[in-house]
Interface confidence: low
């Protein structure tokens, strides 16, 4: 048969994953030893899987010795649970749905998981996991999600001079490693470069036929979907005009699985007050109430009046909900017709991913 390509020694990756799994652990807290041992066992498993490729590699051998030393020091047993797995699961461990959404807790109710939705589009408009809707400034790099399973960060840039409105031109998504299911995978998109692959060139995570994580290109260079079966999570990334939009569905128990130090997450807590574009009654609704707010940086851009913007948005979004209002806001702020498509696709993404139909159309509230 064909010669196999030599695989790369991945000890650095194993070590990085171990550091990522243990950096947040508090040695004074209850359960530290058991969590540390879980991570050590995952580290050991990772080094075993890369052992052939690392033959003769000093870093690899010192890591193996280091693991052995740590196992002894911490009184860790060689057998037992590893990080991010549930040892009692008898179904497919890399399919979140196959074990009722229960993860890292022995037993418990096998209730179907409660899903949460978060979306970001336009100027940018944020729909949080709590179905709160905000228009934010958030210029520069900001985390939407930063939990034990997934990190999503966006970079926003000013859309027009003299306005605090920004839009997203870069998205970075880190699907964190889970023993036996997938190595850590990083996805990055920038305006005019929306790849259908992770940064390492692969299109899936997981061994062999177990596609625990995969990317689907729906529209070349314009729309990709990421399906992470192992964490029951779906992410849509689109480019409309010059900017990117994001829609994410994730099980509640995973979305809320984060450390105190990870509480700057726009999807969880919304925008910081200082980053809200708001005049106290909701800037978007103020515009549509035919009175532009006093403190706002919104200005009717040449080419759109409130009437023409409303007409154009109404064609795509017959329900005058927050998506319609955001569309009008963006047209008046930027004069860029692509924001109509962004608001429309954001609503389509809600309908595809949001678990509760009665909450698809929401109406304005202030920051």
């Amino acid at each position: 048969g064909d010669c196999q390509q030599p695989t790369q020694c991945r000890i650095q990756k194993c070590t990085t994953d171990f550091v990522a799994l243990t950096a947040h652990l508090n040695s004074a807290a209850d359960g530290f030893d058991s969590e540390f041992c879980k991570a050590l066992r995952a580290y050991a498993g990772c080094t075993q899987r890369t052992s052939k490729a690392c033959r003769g590699n000093l870093v690899y051998h010192s890591a193996v010795l280091g693991i052995s030393d740590l196992m002894s020091q911490r009184n860790c047993s060689k057998d037992g649970p590893t990080s991010s797995t549930n040892p009692e699961v008898t179904h497919d461990p890399c399919n979140y749905h196959s074990h009722g959404g229960v993860r890292e807790h022995g037993g418990g109710d096998q209730r179907p998981p409660n899903y949460l939705f978060c979306g970001l589009f336009g100027d940018p408009h944020l729909r949080t996991f709590k179905d709160h809707f905000q228009t934010c400034k958030v210029e520069g790099a900001w985390p939407l999600i930063d939990n034990n399973y997934l990190s999503v960060q966006v970079t926003n840039v000013p859309v027009v001079p003299g306005s605090s409105a920004t839009a997203t031109n870069k998205v970075t998504i880190i699907f964190k490693a889970q023993h036996e299911c997938t190595d850590q995978k990083v996805y990055q998109a920038v305006t005019d470069d929306l790849p259908a692959a992770f940064v390492d060139g692969t299109t899936s995570g997981g061994d062999g036929d177990v596609k625990s994580l995969h990317i689907v290109e729906k529209e070349s260079g314009r729309y990709v979907e990421m399906h992470a079966r192992y964490i029951g999570t779906t992410v849509f990334v689109r480019q409309l005009g010059r900017y990117l939009t994001l829609a994410i569905r994730m099980p509640e128990d995973l979305a809320m699985s984060y450390e105190e130090s990870q509480d700057l997450q726009l999807c969880v807590n919304g925008c910081p007050m200082s980053e809200c574009i708001d005049d106290g009654q909701g800037q978007v609704s103020a515009i549509l109430g035919h009175s532009l707010p006093h403190t706002t940086s919104v200005q009717a851009w040449p080419g759109y009046t409130l009437e023409t913007a409303s007409t154009q948005c109404h064609e795509k979004m017959p329900v005058k909900d927050i998506y319609f209002q955001s569309c009008v806001f963006d047209l008046l702020t930027t004069g860029d017709a692509n924001f109509t498509a962004a608001a429309h696709s954001a609503l389509e993404d809600v309908e595809a991913l949001h678990p509760r139909k009665e909450r698809w159309h929401i109406f304005p509230s202030s920051c």
Partner: antibody
């Protein structure tokens, strides 16, 4: 592979201005933030500001307001730092660096600016 | 302003030593912290980003950890080529570098 090539050493007189350049190659210049960082002799690093070449937007460390001006030329993929009303306090190495997420992954080699009469 | 304090400012260690450098911040920066290495006459080089992620091509003897206000860079087994100054840098609520730790061989 991204490379940031900075202009050469500058010897300037007090009270004058200097404009140093940072030419980017191998990546999309317009879609990344370009930062400038100062390092005085034997000292730490100080952030001056950034420019987003795609639209020319800038943000400065308050300390450098009125001292530093950042510009960019998209056609040549070059970012510029202009320092005005130079004094001996401005004697330093000035680096440009590209921002990815929250970190600076590529740096120029640095430009030494010496202020002397 | 958020203050960043690196300690020690100077450190001498032997080849093979485990070396730990500290970066303390005056308020929570939510792990938004990077580490750089700067050798004499060179530009800084990224080692660790977002507290604990190893930058591509950096040896695995470098690792980072921490949260809240206390952050650490560890060199598990010091090598001669690690002689340099190490800077931490935050990117939460502004871009600021620590004062640096100069690492030398005994």
């Amino acid at each position: 592979q991204v490379q940031l090539q900075q202009s050469g050493t500058e010897l300037v007189k007090p009270g004058s201005s200097v404009k140093i350049s940072c030419k980017a190659s191998g990546d999309t210049f317009t879609s990344d933030y370009m930062h400038w960082i100062r390092q005085q002799p034997g000292s730490g690093l100080e952030w001056i500001g950034w420019i987003y070449p795609g639209n020319g937007n800038t943000k400065y460390n308050q300390k450098f307001d009125g001292k530093a001006t950042l510009t960019a030329d998209k056609s040549s993929s070059t970012a510029y730092l202009q320092l005005s009303l130079l004094t001996s306090e401005d004697y330093a190495v000035y680096f440009c660096a590209r921002q990815t997420e929250g970190y600076f992954d590529y740096w120029g080699q640095g430009v030494m600016v010496t202020v002397s009469s | 302003d958020i203050q960043m304090t690196q300690s020690p400012s100077h450190l001498s260690a032997s080849v093979g030593d485990r070396v730990t450098l500290s970066c303390k911040v005056s308020q929570n920066i939510y792990k938004y912290l990077n580490w750089y290495q700067q050798k004499l006459g060179e530009a800084p080089k990224l080692l660790i980003y977002y507290t604990s992620f190893l930058q591509t091509g950096i040896p695995s003897r470098f690792s980072g950890s921490g949260s809240g206000t206390d952050y650490t860079l560890t060199i598990s087994s010091l090598q001669p080529e690690d002689v340099a100054t190490y800077f931490c840098q935050k990117y939460y609520s502004g871009w600021t570098f620590g004062g640096g730790t100069k690492l030398e061989l005994k």
